[in-house]
Amino acid sequence: ARARNGDHCPLGPGRCCRLHTVRASLEDLGWADWVLSPREVQVTMCIGACPSQFRAANMHAQIKTSLHRLKPDTVPAPCCVPASYNPMVLIQKTDTGVSLRTYDDLLAKDCHCI
């Protein structure tokens, strides 16, 4: 059997694992001492519950869901995490001035439960 990828949230709209955007300043992120730009980042992250087989990434996530129902104190529910990322370029301080650096795992692009 393969992992099912249910997209219906039984908890109600917006309650299950999804992409969420938070606007954050360099100060909010603790980056002000090494990043110069951008001064504000639209941080995309994965937030929400992972009930039943909702967006199960693989068979392991399905097993985790089943065992969590049986032994909630021992087995945690699957977690909502990025399935892929959007890259981002930062202008950052260096010993000699400034430079560009590309980060390929900074912003979530889409989410699943694992």
Partner: antibody
């Protein structure tokens, strides 16, 4: 509507100086980086450098470091590309382009400024 | 010589499917993303595909991008006369310089 409007074509002699401009409108000018791209006649695109108009931080491609200067005046939403001493090999079309939200691609482009350097 | 390698030209008849390749290395396409630009004759480049496979609004779904390993491809289906243009791929190299492919001239036959 996002627009980048560049200054008109220029014909210069070797050794002369030049400053071309790129005026942004329809968006918050200080919230997006501006890049400059060169296209020599019949050739491809070459990235020259980038400026953050909000903080005036500039970074140049090693190929163009020391050859040109990129600047911006945020009070009039305009970025600039300048040469102190032009060479015949600077003859090209120069484009300004706005970086997308993540700084990884160019989502809007100016119409280009043709610079011709000839004695 | 460009860091990213594209074929100088490709051609196809109206209605056909054509692909344009963009070959890089483990220091650019291999670990990062690819964007594609279309430059119609006498005009400025225009963003066609970003982050490998995303289309900006207004770009027809006849255009699609993909990436595998250190190569990327742009596919155009249902080729139209107005698709005749130069196409450029773009990524970054290991020192975070923005790099372009040499460009591919697409000719629509007929």
């Amino acid at each position: 509507e996002v627009q980048l409007v560049q200054s008109g074509a220029e014909v210069k002699k070797p050794g002369e100086s030049l400053k071309i401009s790129c005026k942004g409108s329809g968006y918050s000018f200080t919230s997006y980086w501006i890049g400059w791209v060169r296209q020599m006649p019949g050739k491809g695109l070459e990235w020259m450098g980038v400026i953050d108009p909000g903080g005036s931080y500039t970074i140049y491609s090693p190929s163009f470091q020391g050859q040109v200067t990129i600047s911006a005046d945020k009070s009039i939403s305009t970025a600039y590309l300048q040469w102190s001493s032009l060479k015949a090999s600077d003859t090209a079309m120069y484009y300004c382009a706005r970086y997308g939200r993540y700084g990884t691609y160019f989502d809007y482009w100016g119409q280009g400024t043709l610079v011709t350097v000839s004695s | 010589q460009s860091v990213l390698t594209q074929p100088p030209s490709v051609s196809g008849a109206p209605g056909q499917r054509v692909t344009i390749s963009c070959s890089g290395s483990s220091s650019n396409i291999g670990v990062l993303y690819v964007n594609w630009y279309q430059q119609l004759p006498g005009t400025a480049p225009k963003l066609l595909i970003y982050s490998n496979d995303n289309r900006p609004s207004g770009v027809p779904d006849r255009f699609s991008g993909s990436k595998s390993g250190t190569s990327a491809s742009l596919a155009i289906t249902g080729l139209q006369a107005e698709d005749e243009a130069d196409y450029y791929c773009q990524s970054w190299d290991s020192s975070s310089n923005y790099v372009f492919g040499g460009g591919t001239k697409l000719t629509v036959l007929g």
